[in-house]
């Protein structure tokens, strides 16, 4: 099974005719407390823009990016280096559609590290590419303090101690 070819989430060539390939994506909680249901049609439409990128075996493709889901567990910093060694980075989530894609492909309900940590230098939550988190889109549950790193669970972002060991997601 080459998941890199989009087998797990078939929206090839922007076509979503095979309805049996989809599960319900479910609700996503946004910062103001309102909910919006992300449909499979939304997910497919958002992917139709870029069908040319091919990911490696073991990597999933979505919206022109490649995603790798770990099976083992590491601290946030070890996960960060692991992705770096693969010339990728810990997951940066840009919007709810991407969060829905991630959640759809997480086969467990435990915490998963993402590329977001609290930097004491900036005193703010910062993605690994240096950009700040958009508080209008995402709310982080838990303390914003030194040695806090972000993990996702059931489409929500939580503040956790960076030395905790969780699974992680790399992206390029």
């Amino acid at each position: 099974l080459l998941v890199s070819q989009g087998v797990l989430l078939k929206c090839q060539k922007g076509s979503c005719s095979n309805a049996t390939q989809y599960e319900d994506t479910g609700d996503l909680k946004v910062n103001n407390g309102t909910r919006r249901n992300i449909s499979n049609k939304d997910l497919c439409a958002s992917r139709s823009a870029d069908q040319t990128v091919l990911c490696q075996s073991e990597w999933l493709k979505y919206q022109g990016k490649c995603y790798w889901f770990s099976n083992e567990m590491k601290s946030w910093s070890d996960s960060y280096v692991y992705c770096l060694e693969r010339k990728s980075h810990l997951l940066i989530i840009h919007d709810q559609l991407e969060m829905a894609f991630i959640q759809k492909n997480l086969r467990q309900l435990n915490y998963v590290w993402i590329g977001l940590n609290f930097t004491s230098l900036k005193m703010t939550w910062t993605w690994v590419d240096g950009s700040p988190i958009d508080s209008k889109i995402f709310f982080i549950k838990g303390p914003a303090k030194e040695n806090s790193c972000a993990a996702i669970k059931e489409s929500k972002i939580f503040s956790e101690t960076c030395s905790s060991v969780f699974k992680w997601i790399c992206q390029y």
């Epitope: 080459l2 890199s4 490696q56 070890d78 280096v81 770096l84 060694e85 693969r86 010339k87």
Partner: antibody, heavy 117, light 110 residues
């Protein structure tokens, strides 16, 4: 630039350590230093790489695991330790650097050093 | 391990002609493929990376294409200086990382 040294004539079942020395840059950045070999008249064969970042992770071809060990010894040197050598290990050994950018490519190569078993 | 299979082993063409070298990966490697040129007694020289990006200073007569498992190096307007052995090299980046080479293609220019 890169330069390999330590190539020699060695007896079967013997051991040898090759050194790769960098000039013009140090291994303080995060990239891969790799070893590749080429038997006389044959093709290139990847041996393994070491990541020069804090983790110092090493990756080897399946056939090289156990007999070959790559180590970063100083800020400008990487070594390849080879044990239980056989005639099949006779080759020119190259060290190469995989650029630190987001792209995978060996953009700097040494001239090679000959190992004869 | 990922295996890179290169064809043909040898190809002959006239000056001004075109040669095509193919490289196949046993698993998808995305666009993580490089092409090298090697002449006798010299280390390999990088020509193309990320399947199709020309290394600085390499003439545009060299063109790389492909992604996933199928890749091609095309050399057009052949010159005598192009006589060499060409290697593809994939990079596999998942649980482990490997950089396997293809077996090489000798290009003879008549």
């Amino acid at each position: 630039s890169l330069e390999e040294s330590g190539g020699d004539l060695v007896q079967p079942e013997g051991s040898l350590t090759l050194t790769c020395t960098a000039s013009g840059f140090s291994f303080s950045g995060s990239y891969y230093m790799c070893w590749v070999r080429q038997a006389p008249g044959k093709g290139l064969e990847w041996i393994g790489c070491i990541y020069t970042g804090s983790s110092g992770s090493t990756y080897y071809a399946s056939w090289a695991k156990g007999r070959f060990t790559i180590t970063k010894t100083l800020s400008t040197t990487v070594t390849l330790q080879m044990t239980s050598l056989t005639a099949a290990d006779t080759a020119t050994y190259f060290c190469a650097r995989d650029t630190g950018s987001t792209y995978w490519r060996y953009n700097i190569w040494g001239p090679g050093t000959l190992v004869t078993v | 391990d990922v295996v890179m299979t290169q064809t043909p082993a040898s190809v002959e063409a006239a000056v001004g002609g075109t040669v095509t070298i193919k490289c196949q990966a046993s698993q998808s490697i995305g666009s993580d493929l490089a092409w090298y040129q090697q002449k006798p007694g010299q280390p390999p020289k990088l020509l193309i990376y990320t399947a199709s990006t020309l290394e600085s200073g390499v003439p545009s007569r060299f063109r790389g294409s492909g992604s996933g498992t199928e890749f091609t190096l095309t050399i057009s307007d052949l010159e005598c200086a192009d006589a060499a052995t060409y290697y593809c090299q994939g990079t596999y980046r998942s649980s482990s990382i490997s950089w396997p080479f293809g077996g090489g293609t000798e290009v003879v220019v008549k």
